[in-house]
């Protein structure tokens, strides 16, 4: 499975979109986890709503938010107020019982803010809606460590 590299600015939001086959993953919850080491376990950060029909609702754990458009086959994860400690390898997962299928591997890189926090007090952040459909678009730079994006499953 290819690894997608996403770069975000410290203090900003980084949005990750993982696409999947909506029919194949019908009825399955999704999760975002952080890989502990190259071969280590993937530690759950946040997962979608426990009721699959409500997966479009945003679920939050700390500064990480997840929402799933189950009909379109896109799960969106937003890392808010990105910090240097957020850098690392993550996975989008599709959950089936106790098993987790990796949808996408994502390497998050955090870039230092060139403004160095100047004028940070003047930044305006629009109020967000509760559901996926109203999610604001976050900006990020991405590249792929291997070939195509999104990776084929």
């Amino acid at each position: 499975l290819n690894t997608t590299v996403l770069q975000g600015m410290a203090g900003q939001s980084l949005r990750v979109s993982c696409t999947y086959d909506a029919l194949k993953h019908w009825g399955r919850r999704k999760a975002w986890c952080r890989q502990l080491g190259e071969e280590g376990p993937c530690q759950r950060v946040v997962s979608t709503h426990g009721v699959w029909l409500l997966a479009f609702l945003k679920k939050r754990n700390g500064s990480t938010v997840i929402a799933d458009d189950t009909l379109a086959g896109t799960v969106t994860i937003t890392l808010k107020n990105l910090q240097a400690g957020d850098a690392g390898l993550y996975q989008c997962q599709s959950l089936r019982g106790r098993e987790a299928e990796v949808l996408q591997k994502v390497l998050v890189e955090v870039l230092e803010d060139p403004l160095d926090d100047q004028d940070a007090g003047d930044l305006w952040v629009p109020e967000e809606s509760s559901s996926f459909e109203g999610a604001q678009v976050e900006h990020s730079t991405s590249r792929n460590q291997e070939t195509s994006f999104p990776p084929t499953s």
Partner: antibody, heavy 126, light 106 residues
């Protein structure tokens, strides 16, 4: 007029089955999630389960206490939602309501229920 | 599972009074909360959705606020037709209802 009408309630012995119907009119039935709730005599409201709209291919979700015993289904051609109740227990005695999930203007839905039926009484007793 | 604690369980107020009902969730539920009115022998009626949005056709004297764990439902000026039981309902987990608040006229 947007309307939901439940039917099929009555007295049933423990362990037996009963099927409730919820007939919809005045709206495009297939576009909405339909839910069942219940209210035991003198008690509060309890969510039983719901069934997704046509887009969700009738996917169902249930509260833990009825999972494996109750089944929700829908017939789009007749605009009817059903609640099949098997292995009934005395604690299932309640007024059962069907309700429609609210749709946002942009097409998404919210689990707030904006149209309700009048309710049908189910009594489980020997 | 999330527990919804509604208070008070009952209250008595005069016509024209401001009435406030609170609903507390056992954990953060964002703004995933609705409020319903149920009159004796009748089905519930949706008043407020997403914690603060007034349902179409509902009088503006009804309002809702709050986020996280603490939510408030307010009737700005109580009317005789507002005699009912009011319920909050969360949808952050499995659509749990509060125990209800019975509102009566003094």
């Amino acid at each position: 007029e947007v309307q939901l009408v439940e039917s099929g309630g009555g007295l049933v012995q423990p362990g037996r089955s009963l099927r409730l119907s919820c007939t919809a009119s005045g709206f495009t039935f297939g576009e909405y999630t339909m839910s069942w709730f219940r209210q035991a005599p003198g008690k509060g409201l309890e969510w039983v389960g719901f069934i997704g709209s046509k887009a969700y291919a009738g996917t169902t979700e249930y509260t833990a206490s009825v999972k494996g015993r109750f089944t929700i289904s829908r017939d789009g051609s007749k605009s009817i939602a059903y609640l099949q109740m098997n292995s009934l227990k005395t604690e299932d005695t309640a007024v059962y309501y069907c309700a429609r999930g609210k749709r946002y203007s942009y097409g998404g839905w919210v689990p707030a229920f904006d149209v309700w039926g009048q309710g049908t009484m189910v009594t489980v007793s020997s | 599972d999330i527990q919804m604690t509604q208070s008070p369980s009952s209250l008595s107020a005069s016509v024209g009074d401001r009435v406030t009902i609170t609903c507390q969730a056992s954990q953060d539920i964002t703004n995933y909360l609705n409020w319903y009115q149920q009159k004796p022998g009748k089905a519930p009626k949706l008043l407020i959705y997403d914690a603060s949005n007034l349902e179409t056709g509902v009088p503006s004297r009804f309002s809702g606020s709050g986020s996280g764990t603490d939510f408030t439902f307010t009737i700005s000026s109580l009317q005789p037709e507002d005699i009912a039981t009011y319920y909050c309902q969360e949808y952050d987990s499995y659509l749990a209802f509060g125990g209800g608040t019975k509102v009566e006229i003094k």
